[in-house]
């Protein structure tokens, strides 16, 4: 038998301690929210909010402008001044809870924890490739806001998620806020609402539709809104909330809420429980049937998938999939599985399950004892009755009321437990060529860029590197601008190339040339690198013979 070179073990073919320097910006305080803007004339910006300040950065993370958003009551607060002479309410720091783009006349909308959670609209001013903000407009009309009914009170100090949808020419703000008794009593934000921005930007139209946790449940039943997004005909919110109203706070689980993006009403509000599990290939004795549950969503992102993953998920290439990072939760006992798992929920399948759930509730024969659910939002009732009614009403349709779908959607960890002890705190998924890549931030300040594939028993890394020495957790919000992602950790914002920061972590030529084509890696004498880093010969096709 011919002699062969010994194989290099897979783990020895890469070094994740290689240092990569990526562009960064020091914000001067803990980054609270971040959003990017890409205009149609090559102008772009990164907006970064910290306590009492909003930074406008160029795509290169150089500072362009900075705006004081607090403290409320301070003469230096530039946004507060837009509301005219005060006082406007209690003074205090402004934590930015919402930072979204209003598409119509492109503008940035920011909403903070101060001044009853009101918002400000900043027109965008492109100057060359940079973007500036105009003086803010105060989205608050004193005469139509009262403590018990406040259309212009948007942000909750406990957290708010907003997705903006254009319907016709109007901009509708789909808002989801975490509440407790104290917050609910102060200028009455709602749990879920759809608010129309008035054409004259004088605030939001009164008489908006909303759902709120009922007063009797406010103390025990809290909902955390983790993520929101718009795709197709719907807006989706992802929540972590108690599994049971009666046992609240109790065990937590994750739900997807679906709202119509074409009709600003909540009659077709639907919720579905998302179930993510770790199912090891070989089940240990005593391990739960169907896998170990990971009920608590940490972060989520939806994206169209590449051909390879689409095939594994039995869906078409380019279809939208919701990816979630789940953890076991505090009361799950000593688990033997990984710290984080990643589950994939195809949107079309989610919609089908929801629609089937509506049929089960509303089409005869209705299974006796099937509950409409959402008892924290509405009076208890059985299908097909409207909330609070003992029998169906002839004038009302069963479908025109909120519903919790009776079945859950169960998936298993895409990574088969291979994330191990890694605690994922941020997630952004991209499609590159026919490959789907998960860009993940971790609790110890690292970035993992990993190919998403179900069938492998190892992780296909694009990169795994540390953002710096602080080791602070990477925050939940991730934004994209062109070929870069922007991650925040502590008081810093980092710009990470989608195709990875480099190739130097691949130590062998074989491993280097097996890297995904989109990474642009090639063998360069005695190291793996990109062509522009390589003054000499650069080879992407074959390795020099080993001597």
């Amino acid at each position: 038998k011919e002699w062969q070179c010994p194989r290099t073990p897979y783990a020895a073919s890469r070094d994740f301690n290689v240092k990569y320097m990526v562009p960064s910006f020091s914000a001067g305080g803990l980054v609270q929210t971040m959003v990017t803007y890409q205009g149609d004339k090559n102008e772009s910006a990164v907006f970064v909010a910290i306590r009492n300040r909003l930074h406008v950065l160029g795509p290169d993370l150089k500072s362009v402008q900075s705006l004081a958003t607090g403290p409320a009551g301070d003469p230096g607060c530039q946004t507060c001044a837009a509301c005219g002479p005060g006082p406007h309410g209690p003074s205090g720091d402004t934590d930015t809870k919402v930072l979204v783009l209003e598409p119509a006349l492109p503008a940035l909308v920011s909403c903070g924890s101060s001044l009853q959670g009101r918002c400000f609209l900043h027109d965008l001013d492109p100057q060359g490739t940079a973007v500036h903000l105009a003086a803010p407009a105060c989205l608050f009309s004193a005469h139509h806001n009262r403590p018990d009914d406040c259309p212009d009170c948007v942000a909750s100090p406990l957290g708010t998620r907003v997705t903006v949808v254009e319907q016709g020419q109007a901009s509708y703000f789909y808002v989801a806020s975490s509440l407790d008794a104290a917050v609910a009593a102060s200028f009455s934000p709602r749990s879920v609402s759809i608010r129309r921005l008035k054409a004259d930007a004088s605030g939001f139209a009164p008489g908006f539709v909303a759902l709120s946790v009922l007063p009797k449940h406010l103390v025990s039943y809290s909902i955390e809104y983790v993520h929101s997004f718009h795709t197709g005909a719907f807006v989706y919110f992802l929540t972590v909330q108690p599994a049971s109203v009666t046992d609240a706070p109790g065990a937590l689980h994750t739900r997807l809420a679906r709202l119509s993006a074409t009709e600003p009403e909540l009659g077709d509000y639907r919720e579905l429980v998302l179930d993510c599990r770790f199912a090891p290939k070989r089940r240990r004795r005593g391990a739960p049937e169907g896998g170990q549950p990971y009920p608590v969503l940490r972060v989520a992102h939806s994206a169209p998938v590449g051909a390879q993953l689409a095939t594994e998920l039995s869906i078409a290439e380019g279809q939208e999939v919701l990816f979630g990072v789940f953890v076991a939760g505090k009361d799950s006992g000593p688990g033997v599985g990984p710290n984080s798992v990643v589950c994939a929920f195809p949107i079309d399948l989610l919609d089908t399950l929801i629609d089937e759930g509506v049929e089960r509730c509303c089409e005869s024969p209705v299974h006796p004892g099937l509950r409409r659910g959402l008892d924290f939002f509405q009076s208890p009732s059985f299908c097909p009755n409207p909330p609070g009614l003992e029998a169906p009403s002839p004038n009302t349709s069963c479908r025109h009321f909120p519903l919790l779908v009776s079945s859950s959607f169960s998936r298993v960890d895409l990574f088969n437990g291979l994330l191990g002890t890694v605690e994922v705190t941020a997630l952004y998924v991209t499609r590159l060529d026919n490959v789907t890549v998960a860009h993940m931030g971790t609790a110890d300040g690292r970035i993992l860029q990993v190919e998403l594939a179900r069938s492998l028993n190892y992780l296909l890394y694009v990169s795994n590197f540390s953002l710096g020495d602080s080791g602070q957790p990477v925050q939940r919000d991730v934004s994209r601008l062109g070929d870069h992602l922007f991650f925040a950790s502590g008081d810093q914002v980092f710009q990470v190339p989608i195709q990875g920061p480099g190739c130097r972590h691949f130590l062998t030529c074989g491993r280097c040339l097996r890297a995904q084509r989109f990474m642009g890696c090639g063998w360069c004498g005695n190291m793996c690198g990109r062509q522009k880093e390589c003054p000499g010969s650069w080879q992407q096709d074959h390795c020099p013979p080993k001597l």
Partner: antibody
Framework: EVQLQQSGPELVKPGASMKISCKAS????????MNWVKQSHGKKLEWIGL????????IYNQKFKGKATLTVDKSSSTAYMELLSLTSEDSAVYYC?????????????WGQGASVTVSS | DILLTQSPAILSVSPGERVSFSCRAS??????IHWYQQRTNGSPRLLIK???ESISGIPSRFSGSGSGTDFTLSINSVESEDIADYYC?????????FGAGTKLEVK
């Protein structure tokens, strides 16, 4: 003193296109959106659309989409409205009016109007 | 689209009288209504903004009121220079819309 100076009256043939200008002075041109309003001979006022000179963003009345195109030239503080494929229905006086799109403001200054007559 | 209905179409009053113009919106628009005066061969001129807010340079005899769907413009002592058409305009929703106008005549 705030002024909006519009171009003069025009007589144009059916099927042709034409451009009306509105030159702003006496204020920061990019600070206000520019609105365009049509007044037919029946005295009816119709809002055509607006442009934000700040960033070129536009919002149109659906009724005038495809009929009117709004642009600005920041360097000369001038707003333009091009009217396409003119018919007799487009004969009217067209006004430009500035508006600060935020609570507390309305269309506070108007141009003198540009009369357009479409006739063969 | 929000329809604004102005009534009456023509108002005829004597100098010194008080006069009121009505504007009704097809749906609630808060106070996002503005009033304009247009004299013969002139451009519209802003009189009142946001239902009741006065405009500098506009005589104090002009005032506005209302919210929701019903709005009123009043001239508390009409003068001959007030002969004009009066229009209401809403800025609550796109597209912005105007009422058909009320013509003021002085006897």
């Amino acid at each position: 003193e705030v002024q909006l100076q519009q171009s003069g009256p025009e007589l144009v043939k059916p099927g042709a296109s034409m451009k009306i200008s509105c030159k702003a002075s006496g204020y920061s041109f990019t600070g206000y959106t520019m609105n365009w309003v049509k007044q037919s001979h029946g005295k009816k006022l119709e809002w055509i659309g607006l442009i934000n000179p700040y960033n070129g963003g536009t919002i149109y009345n659906q009724k005038f989409k495809g009929k009117a195109t709004l642009t600005v030239d920041k360097s000369s503080s001038t707003a333009y409205m091009e009217l396409l494929s003119l018919t007799s229905e487009d004969s009217a006086v067209y006004y430009c009016a500035r508006w600060l799109r935020r609570g507390g403001y309305a269309m506070d200054y108007w141009g003198q109007g540009a009369s357009v007559t479409v006739s063969s | 689209d929000i329809l604004l209905t102005q009534s009456p179409a023509i108002l005829s009053v004597s100098p010194g009288e008080r006069v009121s113009f009505s504007c009704r919106a097809s749906q609630s628009i808060g106070t996002s209504i503005h009033w304009y005066q247009q004299r013969t061969n002139g451009s519209p001129r802003l009189l009142i903004k946001f239902a009741s807010e006065s405009i500098s340079g506009i005589p104090s005899r002009f005032s506005g009121s209302g919210s929701g769907t019903d709005f009123t413009l009043s001239i508390n002592s009409v003068e001959s220079e007030d002969i004009a058409d009066y229009y209401c305009q809403q800025s609550d929703s796109w597209p912005l819309t105007f009422g058909a106008g009320t013509k003021l005549e002085v006897k």
